[in-house]
């Protein structure tokens, strides 16, 4: 058995185990350097146990500290295309709402790669709401295997 | 103490504490695109843990969500050597087996790097078996501490 | 809830929990190539539950697999700046004490790029020391959302 | 099989260059850099330096300050070495060959031989 | 640039007996886990033969009396059991950092 009988009886979500894992639906409008997410068994391999999509950003439902990973691959995309602009392309994840808890989490630049891929433990509150920000000219891979962005609740 | 009385008197992997970090062993013959994996404590830091290997490719024993990562560094490798080709040096993880789940779970492109490293979060079945597959003509380095596979179980 | 009541009696770090987030405070002088980390909620979302610093490096507290996960970003980097040294700036993650177990776990080589950012699971011990070391003439980002390195115990 | 087949024998005047060509069989050719190592009478090897024919880069020993270049043309399949300057101690078998699918200087295929003396 | 230094210079042995040539690099050749460290073949008249790559990796059709090892700067071929048609030059070569060098080459005779 994976469980003590005690925690068999109890919903899996109120053992803290709160868990989603994203992929791209679709970028935003010009103006708006937001990635937007879909999940779910549906879609594939992506699914939400706990946490929730408003408008395709991530909700966490419930407090503690987690482990945020993402990647993200820009598509028909060689080391030329990252390297040759004054700004290169970066990709931030960060609290964005509630506008008081606003703030950036974790922050990479393409450079001469195309691909970006990393992790890190934060602190999240209930409600607050991950924005992945994408700044630049060229479009991210919707392949699966390629961009995704996740979450897993490891302590309070 | 780490765990209450109860849970002491489990097995460890009767918890759901499936987890393994792999070293390279070898790669396969040049039609093979496969990297082949080992672990255990006699060699070094790496341990298996509930999951096995079968010919140097791990098969998960548990179902659940669990964390993939992988690193991965090319031997004598320079920015030239990796971007000069018009088909990238990639590294693929996928479940190989049973054919029926036969899917990519994670995909990078080394460009102007000479290491890929990145993580996610997947559902995986009793039975699966995960593949690596480095396509292009360098050589993955053997080094412990630049080249290593792991997974673990995160959630039912 | 989100423990059991027999569990929410214990301490968590009783659990197993131990876990810390850490950023960077400074790089030591020209003869010592490890980073310096500093973590605490007076400093933003850093913490530590169970680990400990010792004049700025990590000190592990409860024997046990632990992920250790880092990301660093080169200060005022371009590529040119990365690839332009014969020796590549590199940075390597290993336990420094005690002597008797010193090791690399973990290396990555900047090349082109100006982040590295990677993570793997790893036995660690009471007592291991652990130092992650910056060779080369860049300097690493101090932002908080740039560069940073973590533990998380995961299994005993 | 691959197969790298070599021009033939040539007699050069000190002073003048030569051009030695190597054609590759199968379609993979822009894909692996292509070596040139050549072997004086009764002495060892010696690297000459590679080209890799996708985009014309190259990489020389330095023993030979310039005097050689490397040239590719892909629609053809044929690596060309080119040496300038020739003296007496230029006389030597002249080799290109090529690792078998890494991108590693070690060599799998070899042409077999171009012989080139150097004789006033 | 590393050199490569081959002993002995000539080698005579007997049919059937081992045979054993030693190559020694000025400095390392091995890195992330390999030995860039190759052995060659030659006849007269004929190029290089490829018989080991990476220290001790038996290339396809080479027969398995042709054994190679060691690491670092220290590296050996051997012939288990001599054969007449093994008489020919031996090369060491490394590719660990350009430009690969070779060794002077050990004439391998019949005793």
């Known amino acids: 058995q994976r469980l003590s009988r005690a925690q068999q009886q109890l919903p899996l979500e109120s053992l803290g185990w709160d868990i989603a894992e994203l992929q791209l639906n679709h970028t935003g409008p010009q103006q708006d350097p937001r990635l937007y997410w879909q999940g779910g068994p549906a879609l594939g391999r992506s699914f939400l146990h706990g946490p929730e999509l408003d408008k395709g950003q991530l909700r966490i439902r419930r407090d503690g500290i987690y482990m945020v990973h993402i990647q993200v691959t820009l598509a028909i995309c060689s080391s030329t295309s990252t390297s040759r602009h004054h700004h290169p392309t970066t990709l931030a994840v960060g609290i964005c709402s509630p506008a008081s808890r606003s703030i950036s989490l974790l922050r990479l630049s393409f450079h001469q790669g195309c691909t970006i891929a990393s992790q890190r433990l934060t602190p999240l509150a209930r409600g607050d709401t991950l924005c992945t920000n994408l700044t630049g000219t060229l479009l991210p891979s919707r392949n699966t295997d390629e961009t995704f962005f996740g979450v897993q609740w490891v302590r309070p | 103490q780490r765990l209450s009385r109860a849970q002491q008197q489990l097995p460890l992997e009767s918890l759901g504490w499936d987890i393994a970090e792999l070293q390279l062993n070898h790669t396969g013959p040049q039609q093979d695109p496969r990297l082949y994996w080992q672990g255990g404590p006699a060699l070094g830091r790496s341990f298996l843990h509930g999951p096995e290997l079968d010919k140097g490719q791990l098969r998960i024993r548990r179902d659940g969500i669990y964390m993939v990562h992988i690193q991965v560094t090319l031997a004598i490798c320079s920015s030239t050597s990796t971007s000069r080709h018009h088909h990238p040096t990639t590294l693929a993880v996928g479940i190989c087996s049973p054919a029926s789940r036969s899917i990519s779970l994670l995909r990078l492109s080394f460009h102007q790097g000479c290491t890929i490293a990145s993580q996610r979060l997947t559902p995986l079945a009793r039975g699966d078996t995960l593949c690596t597959n480095l396509t292009g003509t360098l050589l993955p380095s053997r080094n412990t501490d630049e080249t290593f596979f792991g997974v673990q179980w995160v959630r039912p | 809830q989100r423990l059991s009541r027999a569990q929410q009696q214990l301490p968590l770090e009783s659990l197993g929990w131990d876990i810390a987030e850490l950023q960077l405070n400074h790089t030591g002088p020209q003869q010592d190539p490890r980073l310096y980390w500093q973590g605490g909620p007076a400093l933003g979302r850093s913490f530590l539950h169970g680990p400990e610093l010792d004049k700025g490096q990590l000190r592990i507290r409860r024997d046990g697999i632990y992920m250790v996960h880092i990301q660093v970003t080169l200060a005022i980097c371009s590529s040119t700046s990365t690839s332009r040294h014969h020796h590549p700036t590199t940075l390597a993650v290993g336990i420094c004490s005690p002597a008797s177990r010193s090791i690399s776990l973990l290396r990555l080589s900047f090349h082109q790029g100006c982040t590295i950012a990677s993570q793997r699971l790893t036995p660690l011990a009471r007592g291991d020391t652990l130092c992650t070391n910056l060779t080369g003439t860049l300097l690493p980002s101090r932002n908080t959302d740039e560069t940073f390195f973590g533990v998380q115990w995961v299994r005993p | 099989e691959v197969q790298l087949v070599q021009s033939g024998a040539e007699v050069k005047k000190p002073g003048s260059s030569v051009k030695v060509s190597c054609k590759a069989s199968g379609d993979t050719f822009p894909r692996y850099n292509m070596h040139w190592v050549r072997q004086a009478p009764g002495q060892g090897l010696e690297w000459m330096g590679a080209?890799?024919?996708?985009?014309?880069?190259?990489s020389y020993n330095q023993n030979f300050k310039g005097r050689v270049t490397l040239t590719a043309d892909k629609s053809t399949s044929t690596a060309y070495m080119e040496l300038s300057s020739l003296r007496s101690e230029d006389t030597a078998v002249y080799y290109c060959a090529r690792n078998s699918y890494y991108d590693y200087a070690w060599f799998t295929y070899w042409g077999q031989g171009t012989l080139v003396t150097v004789s006033s | 640039d590393i050199v490569m230094t081959q002993s002995p210079d000539s080698l005579a042995v007997s049919l059937g007996e081992r045979a054993t040539i030693n190559c020694r690099a000025s400095?390392?050749?091995?890195?992330?886990?390999?030995?860039?460290m190759h052995w060659y073949q030659q006849k007269p008249g004929q190029p290089p033969k490829l018989l080991i790559s990476l220290a001790d990796n038996l290339e396809s059709g080479v027969p398995d009396r042709f054994s190679g090892s060691g690491s670092g700067t220290d590296f050996t071929l051997t012939i288990s059991s001599l054969q007449a048609e093994d008489v020919a030059v031996y090369y060491c070569q490394h590719s660990r950092e350009f430009p690969p060098t070779f060794g002077q080459g050990t004439k391998l005779e019949i005793k």
């Open positions: 400095k390392s050749v091995s890195s992330s886990g390999y030995s860039f």
């Open positions: 080209i890799f024919p996708g985009t014309g880069e190259t």
